[in-house]
């Protein structure tokens, strides 16, 4: 699995999307987990409703929410009030009994709020030991662009 990078601004919300084949994963609950180290386990943060039919209902664990469009095949995770410690490697998972299939590997990067004039050194990225040369960047900054600002260029 390649790693997809989602960037969000500290203090704001970040929405992560994980597309999947809806028929392949029919009937399977989904989960969002945080990777503990490069080869460590993936610690469950939040999972969809216990009843698969109700997967569209948003479930929260602290500031993290999950909802699943089981027909369209898109799992959406919302990280509210993004904080420096939220930066890191995560996975979207499809659950089947005790099995967990990885739908997408996600690297969350937390950017300093440009409107926040605190210490300019407050940029939060995962440790340099992690290599994501093939990572695909999804810019998911949730605030509206200010007049005159240039939005991030689209990525392929």
């Amino acid at each position: 699995h390649n790693t997809t990078v989602f960037q969000g601004v500290a203090g704001q919300s970040l929405q992560v999307s994980c597309p999947y084949d809806s028929m392949k994963h029919w009937g399977r609950r989904k989960a969002w987990c945080r990777q503990l180290g490069e080869k460590g386990p993936c610690q469950r943060v939040v999972s969809t409703h216990n009843l698969w039919l109700l997967s569209f209902l948003r479930r929260w664990n602290g500031s993290t929410a999950i909802t699943d469009d089981t027909l369209g095949g898109t799992l959406t995770i919302t990280l509210r009030n993004l904080q420096p410690h939220d930066a890191g490697l995560y996975q979207c998972q499809s659950l089947h009994g005790s099995e967990a299939d990885t739908l997408r590997k996600v690297l969350v990067e937390v950017l300093a709020d440009p409107l926040d004039h605190r210490d300019a050194g407050d940029l939060w990225f995962p440790g340099e030991s992690e290599s994501f040369e093939d990572a695909h960047v999804e810019h998911s900054i949730s605030r509206s662009l200010l007049e005159g600002e240039i939005p991030f260029p689209p990525t392929s």
Epitope: D21, M23, K24, W26, G27, L53
Partner: antibody, heavy 122, light 107 residues
């Protein structure tokens, strides 16, 4: 109507390989997992593995890892199971079956092929 | 892997009697269970899915019940065409193992 048509009986020598086929019709081939099941004479059903033709993702029970290889050809809506290093205990009827789904998200094998008999003999 | 223990292995019954076959899973399978009937020399046929739901065309004398680790298939007023083999199968993660089967024969 949904149909799974399996290939004809096989007679093989010990140590040889055979490739069984299961041709699907009457539904969207790439959207349903296909299961393979073994049944030795006078014995019960034994689950071998499953493949999702949409992307070729295959899962096997531990016993059949290395023994069975599942593949799928989208262009012909056909799933294949190759059995290698054949031995007498591989003599059995092999079934393919579609993994049906329900609106509530449950699975069951709703359509079965007629079975292919494999006899391993020197 | 989840083990499915099916009982009895065989039973002899008369037409019109009621039969109950049970299946025990080695862990909770959350009703992800199917029952099949197989006649000699034929492919299995789906009877029950999701533990309690009858497949299309299955007579109402068949019924499935259970939850957690314990499941059963009941056949009321057994008919001559009901004789054969019955298997349970779980779908709570691969491998989708079967029970050992139950042979229902005429007394």
């Amino acid at each position: 109507q949904v149909q799974l048509q399996q290939s004809g009986a096989e007679l093989a020598r010990p140590g040889a390989s055979v490739k069984l086929s299961c041709k699907a019709s009457g539904y969207t081939f790439t959207s349903y997992w296909i299961q393979w099941v073994k049944q030795r004479p006078g014995q019960g059903l034994e689950w071998i593995g499953t493949i999702y033709p949409g992307d070729g993702d295959a899962r096997y029970t531990q016993k059949f890892k290395g023994k069975a290889t599942l593949t799928a050809d989208k262009s012909s809506s056909t799933t294949y199971m190759q059995l290698n290093s054949l031995a007498s205990e591989d003599s059995a009827v092999y079934y393919c079956a579609r993994n049906g789904i329900t609106t509530a998200g449950y699975y069951a094998m709703d359509y079965w092929g007629q079975g292919t008999s494999v006899t391993v003999s020197s | 892997d989840i083990q499915m223990t099916q009982s009895p292995a065989s039973l002899s019954v008369s037409v019109g009697e009621t039969v109950t076959i049970t299946c025990r899973a080695s862990e909770n399978i959350y009703s992800n269970l199917a029952w099949y009937q197989q006649k000699q020399g034929r492919s299995p046929q789906l009877l029950v899915y999701a533990a309690t739901n009858l497949a299309d065309g299955v007579p109402s004398r068949f019924s499935g019940s259970g939850s957690g680790t314990q499941y059963s298939l009941k056949i009321n007023s057994l008919q001559s065409e009901d004789f054969g083999y019955y298997y349970c199968q779980h779908f709570w993660g691969t491998p989708y193992t079967f029970g050992g089967g139950t042979k229902v024969e005429i007394k």
